[in-house]
């Protein structure tokens, strides 16, 4: 990119318009999942955040090489996670930083629930939730 590209005007407030989908994914261990972030324009880079618990603050997602991949084109950013594990459970947020401002906008989040129970305690918890 040229140096002046970082000084482009955000197109209207396009940078603030981010739609994240889906809102919820439930898949069995080992499956591949994709989550998407749709933007009105490519007004800035997209990064991904993750939190495990509802009341935590999201942290920058550490991409596991070969298993997690992020891609971005004009108006779509995608996070792909292969071979999902229990530790991938949580809420994933896409975040866009406008190229020439300090403004940061965040999607509403995609909750990932990895199915298949590793312990009796998790099975009991799942049954309780169903009840």
């Amino acid at each position: 990119a040229r140096s002046e590209d970082r000084y482009r005007n955000p197109k209207g407030s396009a940078c603030s318009r981010i739609w994240q989908s889906p809102r919820f994914i439930a898949r069995k261990r080992g499956f591949t999942v994709k989550m998407h972030c749709y933007m009105n324009s490519a007004s800035g880079n997209v990064s991904w955040l993750w939190k495990q618990e509802m009341d935590e603050n999201p942290q920058q997602l550490k991409l596991e090489k070969g298993r997690m991949e992020e891609s971005q084109n004009e108006s779509l950013a995608t996070l792909t996670i292969q071979g999902i594990r229990f530790e991938d459970n949580g809420i994933y947020f896409c975040q866009q930083k406008c190229n020439n401002t300090s403004e940061v906008y965040q999607g509403c989040g995609t909750e990932l629930r990895v199915m298949g129970f590793s312990t009796l305690a998790q099975l009991k918890q799942r049954n309780t939730l169903k009840d």
Partner: antibody, heavy 112, light 111 residues
Framework: QVQLVQSGSELKKPGASVKVSCKAS????????MHWVRQAPGQGLEWMGW????????SYADDFKGRFVFSLDTSVSTAYLQISSLKAEDTAVYYC?????WGQGTLVTVSS | EIVLTQSPATLSLSPGERATLSCKAS??????????MDWYQQKPGQAPRLLIY???NLESGIPARFSGSGSGTDFTLTISSLEPEDFAVYYC?????????FGGGTKVEIK
């Protein structure tokens, strides 16, 4: 080629106002934000703020809120910096710029 | 506000020598894979000239003896072999966060 041409030097009395212009050419004016920088004599560079050339919305650094106003005339691809209630400490060279492109600077001298 | 501290304030060197200028930020100027740190050169009576953008990218038309490195909070501008026209004041600027801020400058003077 891209050019930013600023208005000439100004000598003003304290309390007066001044309007510095920055005429852009060689690119689509409303594509890029315009930023302003102040440099007092013998001092470093101070970023004053910027204006969105598409929407006209200005944003000011804290030290430049109040007496400083950024404006535009997109019909002539020109950005303006207006300073009111001038003080001696406003004496400086004022630059408009975006990315690698800078105006030549406008010296504003405030003296009684 | 991100404060940028440049060192040394003055660097006295001879033509042909290597110049190493430092800029330290009070907090990270990184976002994703980019560092939003630029380096400018300014000579008396002239507007600043952009040399390096996003920490390590050489601006078009700038000689290859200029290079930039660093990420996070620590950045370096290197002039591999000083030419007579390189004696000037150098400023770093962060454009990661408002307000954009400049360092206080490093003057490179002839020894």
């Amino acid at each position: 080629q891209v050019q930013l041409v600023q208005s000439g030097s100004e000598l003003k009395k304290p309390g007066a106002s001044v309007k510095v212009s920055c005429k852009a050419s060689g690119y689509t004016f409303t594509d890029y934000s315009m930023h302003w920088v102040r440099q007092a004599p013998g001092q470093g560079l101070e970023w004053m703020g910027w204006i969105n050339t598409e929407t006209g919305e200005p944003s000011y650094a804290d030290d430049f809120k109040g007496r400083f106003v950024f404006s535009l005339d997109t019909s002539v691809s020109t950005a303006y910096l207006q300073i009111s209630s001038l003080k001696a400490e406003d004496t400086a060279v004022y630059y408009c710029y975006y990315g690698p492109y800078w105006g030549q600077g406008t010296l504003v001298t405030v003296s009684s | 506000e991100i404060v940028l501290t440049q060192s040394p304030a003055t660097l006295s060197l001879s033509p042909g020598e290597r110049a190493t200028l430092s800029c330290k930020a009070s907090q990270s100027v990184d976002h994703d894979v980019d560092s939003y740190m630029d380096w400018y050169q300014q000579k008396p009576g002239q507007a600043p000239r952009l040399l390096i953008y996003s920490a390590s990218n050489l601006e078009s038309g700038i000689p290859a003896r200029f290079s930039g490195s660093g990420s996070g909070t620590d950045f370096t501008l290197t002039i591999s072999s000083l030419e007579p026209e390189d004696f000037a004041v150098y400023y770093c600027q962060q454009i990661n966060e408002y307000p954009y801020t400049f360092g206080g400058g490093t003057k490179v003077e002839i020894k």
